[in-house]
């Protein structure tokens, strides 16, 4: 008799999810000497243990603690780049500016980037058919809780000047409901972080507006200032420059240090 399976509103687990996580872990630890000590099988076991056999609407940050422990990584706290709604450009930037790091440049972020996963209560199966949608089903799902957990830890680790890349082409340049707006902003530590500098990336070729005067940026400034962190905002007008450097990664001079 076929077992009844809960139908969720979101896409199911990414195909070949276990193999993908394991392969990414092996690749990452080969490229990053400081993480060579990591046992990727143990990482996968801890990842799996966070959501397998658990109700996918009842996941907690505690479920991910064994994985967090295994994935503990030290990145230079003054070289952190946060982003909101502009992931690809942020990643292009750190691909060139090798001494800056997004969350997805860390082991745990790299493992889960662009993947979906969930299990089922009381079975060891991975659900490849559907997973809970954050809005339509529940917020405490395996993917959302994972990103909330790693994002909080990443923000807590930041120090000195922290940069955030924001999408100037969106109606809400700063969105309180984004991971940046709801998690990272509130977990920057005022005793460690001196300034949050926002880079508002313009899309249009002829765009010469001052998007740092946007009401949502003023809202971000207000939130940050109330947390006793200084705020700075810069208009960035030529994002195509990032791509030009990415196309020629062998050019060591294509970094912001001159």
């Amino acid at each position: 008799v076929p077992r009844w399976r809960q139908q969720w509103s979101g896409p199911g687990t990414t195909k070949r999810f276990p193999e993908t996580v394991l392969a990414r872990c092996v690749k990452y630890t080969e490229i990053h000497p400081e993480m060579r000590h990591v046992d990727c099988q143990s990482v996968w076991d801890a990842f799996k243990g966070a959501f397998i056999s658990k109700h996918p609407c009842n996941i907690t940050e505690e479920d991910y603690q064994p994985l967090m422990k295994l994935g503990t990584q030290t990145v230079p706290c003054n070289k952190i780049l946060l982003w909101s709604r502009i992931k690809d450009l942020a990643h292009q930037f750190t691909q060139v500016q090798r001494d800056m790091f997004t969350l997805e440049d860390t082991l745990l972020g790299y493992l889960a980037d662009d993947l979906t996963w969930c299990g089922e209560f009381n079975t060891s199966k991975i659900n490849y058919q559907s997973c809970p949608d954050w809005r339509k089903d529940c917020s405490n799902n395996p993917v959302s809780v994972f990103w909330k957990t790693v994002s909080r830890r990443f923000a807590e680790a930041a120090c000195d000047v922290v940069h955030v890349m924001l999408n100037g082409s969106r109606s809400k340049i700063f969105d309180k409901n984004s991971t940046f707006g709801s998690v990272e902003v509130h977990n920057l530590q005022p005793e460690k972080v001196q300034t949050l500098e926002a880079w508002v990336i313009h899309g249009g070729r002829e765009d010469s507006r001052d998007l740092c005067q946007d009401p949502t940026i003023k809202e971000l400034e207000s939130i940050i200032s109330k947390r006793n962190i200084q705020f700075s905002c810069k208009n960035i007008y030529r994002p195509d420059k990032f791509l030009q450097c990415v196309k020629n990664p062998e050019d060591s001079s294509c970094t912001s240090e001159i």
Epitope: F93, V96, Q97, W199, H202, R205, E206, D207, S208, R209, D210, C212, Q213, S232, C233, K234, N235, I236, Y237, R238, D240, K241, F242, Q244, C245, K247, N248, E250, D251, S253, C254, T255, S256, I258
Partner: antibody, heavy 120, light 108 residues
Framework: QVQLVESGGGLVQPGGSLRLSCAAS????????MNWVRQAPGKGLEWVSG????????YYADSVKGRFTISRDNSKNTLYLQMNSLRAEDTAVYYC?????????????WGQGTLVTVSS | DIELTQPPSVSVAPGQTARISCSGD??????VYWYQQKPGQAPVLVIY???KRPSGIPERFSGSNSGNTATLTISGTQAEDEADYYC??????????FGGGTKLTVLR
């Protein structure tokens, strides 16, 4: 090391044309925006034109728009400025300048300049 | 378009601190660059991104940018620092602007 060498300057009559060249070396030319900046005798710096690395995007100061054309040949590592309908006020030393990368839009490296004199 | 305003001249005694200002509407929202130009020579970038110093530029050069004003500071000014100084910013599209320049005189 980065080198920019301008050529093509000289004396030209009002209404005449001139083409400036800038030979670049010491970096991956196609990765960078390139620019022309000028300086009239005894005056300050004035940005004239810029071009993206690929070279799909071109930009011009209002004072030269419609008269000057910037272009580049990435296979030859060379930047050009075609100047038409020249006026006395275009008299200046013309510098070729390489843009800073990524989030910065300033000039990391400059050539030594080539003098353009527009006079009858 | 933003307009950048600099004082035409600044004088300083050797070993003292020189400050050159550059003002423009909401200048803090844009990165500012500073160039040094000596007679008969091409400009040289001394500060980029408000406060970053290119390699080879002495530590006595520093920059800041807040409110409507960016400032180039030269501490322990030396005779060789006598030159014209230009600020510059970029406000999108074809709006790349320089300040009018400041002549720095090191008193003898």
């Amino acid at each position: 090391q980065v080198q920019l060498v301008e050529s093509g300057g000289g004396l030209v009559q009002p209404g005449g044309s001139l083409r400036l060249s800038c030979a670049a070396s010491g970096f991956t030319f196609s990765s960078y925006y390139m620019n022309w900046v000028r300086q009239a005798p005894g005056k300050g710096l004035e940005w004239v034109s810029g071009i993206s690395g690929d070279p799909s995007n071109t930009y011009y100061a209002d004072s030269v728009k419609g008269r000057f054309t910037i272009s580049r040949d990435n296979s030859k590592n060379t930047l050009y400025l075609q100047m038409n309908s020249l006026r006395a006020e275009d008299t200046a030393v013309y510098y070729c300048a390489r843009d800073l990368p990524l989030v910065y839009t300033g000039f990391a490296y400059w050539g030594q300049g080539t003098l353009v004199t527009v006079s009858s | 378009d933003i307009e950048l305003t600099q004082p035409p001249s600044v004088s300083v005694a050797p070993g003292q601190t020189a400050r050159i200002s550059c003002s423009g509407d909401n200048l803090r929202h844009y990165y500012v660059y500073w160039y040094q130009q000596k007679p008969g020579q091409a400009p040289v970038l001394v500060i980029y991104g408000d406060s970053k110093r290119p390699s080879g530029i002495p530590e006595r050069f520093s920059g800041s940018n807040s409110g409507n004003t960016a400032t180039l500071t030269i501490s322990g000014t030396q005779a060789e620092d006598e030159a014209d100084y230009y600020c510059q910013t970029y406000t999108g599209g074809a709006s790349l602007v320089f300040g009018g320049g400041t002549k720095l005189t090191v008193l003898r």
